[in-house]
């Protein structure tokens, strides 16, 4: 079964994949795809190398290591929950059925949100109940602040205050909900 790797929303994710070139600079085509490795190819390709260089890539996907030495580990920049899933690293070694293929599972967790001190003070002072983010299950719920009974005007005001903050971004990316009552 595939190996599992984890990252938080907003971080860069790292998926390792290596091979040993027969000689320095004697590179092998490699492809990375989203989805499990099919029988011959790489799935929905996000990055590809040839015998010389990276010849195809999409935004946010890059090789951070020295691919000329066989480090073809994939970095995914600024991940969101949508980046979760299986990734295929396929090392297309020439010859008959010499391919090495690896399925790697990427699990993205909601960011551990630490509100700005002023926002935290305002929340606690104004609302002694709970603001939470919803992750994949109960264990993923994180307390952000306290809230009392809130009316719709207060929710709107709170949303406006959060709109341009980093906290708002974290809430959006992790599928945040405001729980009332």
């Amino acid at each position: 079964s595939e190996v599992e790797y984890r990252a938080e929303v907003g971080q860069n994710a790292y998926l390792p994949c290596f091979y040993t070139p027969a000689a320095p600079g004697n590179l092998v085509p490699v492809c990375w795809g989203k989805g499990a490795c099919p029988v011959f190819e790489c799935g929905n390709v996000v990055l590809r190398t040839d015998e010389r260089d990276v010849n195809y890539w999409t935004s946010r996907y890059w090789l951070n290591g020295d691919f000329r030495k066989g480090d073809v580990s994939l970095t995914i920049e600024n991940v969101t929950l949508a980046d979760s899933g299986i990734y295929c690293c396929r090392i297309q070694i020439p010859g008959i059925m010499n391919d090495e293929k690896f399925n790697l599972k990427l699990v993205i967790k909601p960011a551990k949100v630490t509100p700005a001190p002023t926002l935290q003070r305002d929340f606690t002072a104004a609302f002694p109940r709970m603001l939470t983010t919803r992750g994949h299950g109960p264990a993923e719920t994180q307390t952000l602040g306290s809230l009392p009974d809130i009316n719709l005007t207060q929710i709107s005001t709170l949303a406006n205050e959060l709109r341009d903050s980093r906290l708002a971004n974290d809430l959006r990316d992790s599928g945040a909900t405001i729980r009332i009552g």
Epitope: V30, C31, A36, P38, V39, F40, E41, Q92, N98, D99
Partner: antibody
Framework: EVQLVESGGGLVQPGGSLRLSCAAS????????MSWVRQAPGKGLEWVAA???????YFPDSVKGRFTISRDNAKNSCYLQMNSLRAEDTAVYYC?????????????WGQGTLVTVSS | DIVLTQSPATLSVSPGERATLSCRAS??????????MQWYQQKPGQAPRLLIY???NVESGVPARFSGSGSGTEFTLTISSLQSEDFAVYYC?????????FGGGTKVEIK
């Protein structure tokens, strides 16, 4: 429009060799796995070779060591070199494009070229 | 190798009727939640044509009367209302493992 045109078929004696060509057009050839599939007269389909976009080769045991597949991305062409031919290799040989991102099934086929192995 | 067994070998159907073709694999062709099974149509003197991929996805340009279903080792191609142009041979094919293999085919003929 995607097109695959096979050539090189014909009559050959047992033990002989033949090289089939597949000229592709209408798509970015280098991005696709290519396969050869054959069909003996009145029989079903049999996959005989594949080459991935990265140049990896795949064969069933029935032809391994006798057939080889290659590609020339600059010429948008794929080739099947058949050696040590046997009577049971007599068939229509189709060039087929593997579906992008997968390669293991075929969304475009040529019209085929007939190979007859007989003395 | 994964052996694909198609049944029946020949199916006699009247135009307008429903046709149900079966393909059984010697082992599961499930892979990360996808069934790696395809269906092709072949008419005399022509190359095969892809109809269904990944068990149930209808290829672009294929009429809606064709549908595929199944998972694991049991798969079905259904033609809801046979048209005259549908009389042909139908093959299933797995893309789970090398060697890629095809079923022996089902000939759909006019009753």
């Amino acid at each position: 429009e995607v097109q695959l045109v096979e050539s090189g078929g014909g009559l050959v004696q047992p033990g002989g060799s033949l090289r089939l060509s597949c000229a592709a057009s209408g798509f970015t050839f280098s991005r696709y796995a290519m396969s050869w599939v054959r069909q003996a007269p009145g029989k079903g389909l049999e996959w005989v070779a594949a080459i991935s976009s990265g140049g990896s080769l795949y064969f069933p045991d029935s032809v391994k060591g006798r057939f080889t597949i290659s590609r020339d991305n600059a010429k948008n062409s794929c080739y099947l070199q058949m050696n040590s031919l046997r009577a049971e290799d007599t068939a229509v040989y189709y060039c087929a494009r593997g579906r992008e991102a997968d390669g293991g099934y075929f969304d475009y086929w040529g019209q085929g070229t007939l190979v007859t192995v007989s003395s | 190798d994964i052996v694909l067994t198609q049944s029946p070998a020949t199916l006699s159907v009247s135009p307008g009727e429903r046709a149900t073709l079966s393909c059984r694999a010697s082992e599961s062709v499930e892979y990360y939640g996808t069934s790696l099974m395809q269906w092709y149509q072949q008419k005399p003197g022509q190359a095969p044509r892809l109809l269904i991929y990944a068990a149930s996805n209808v290829e672009s340009g294929v009429p809606a009367r064709f549908s595929g279903s199944g998972s694991g080792t049991e798969f079905t191609l259904t033609i809801s209302s046979l048209q005259s142009e549908d009389f042909a041979v139908y093959y299933c094919q797995q893309s789970m493992k090398v060697p890629l293999t095809f079923g022996g085919g089902t000939k759909v003929e006019i009753k």
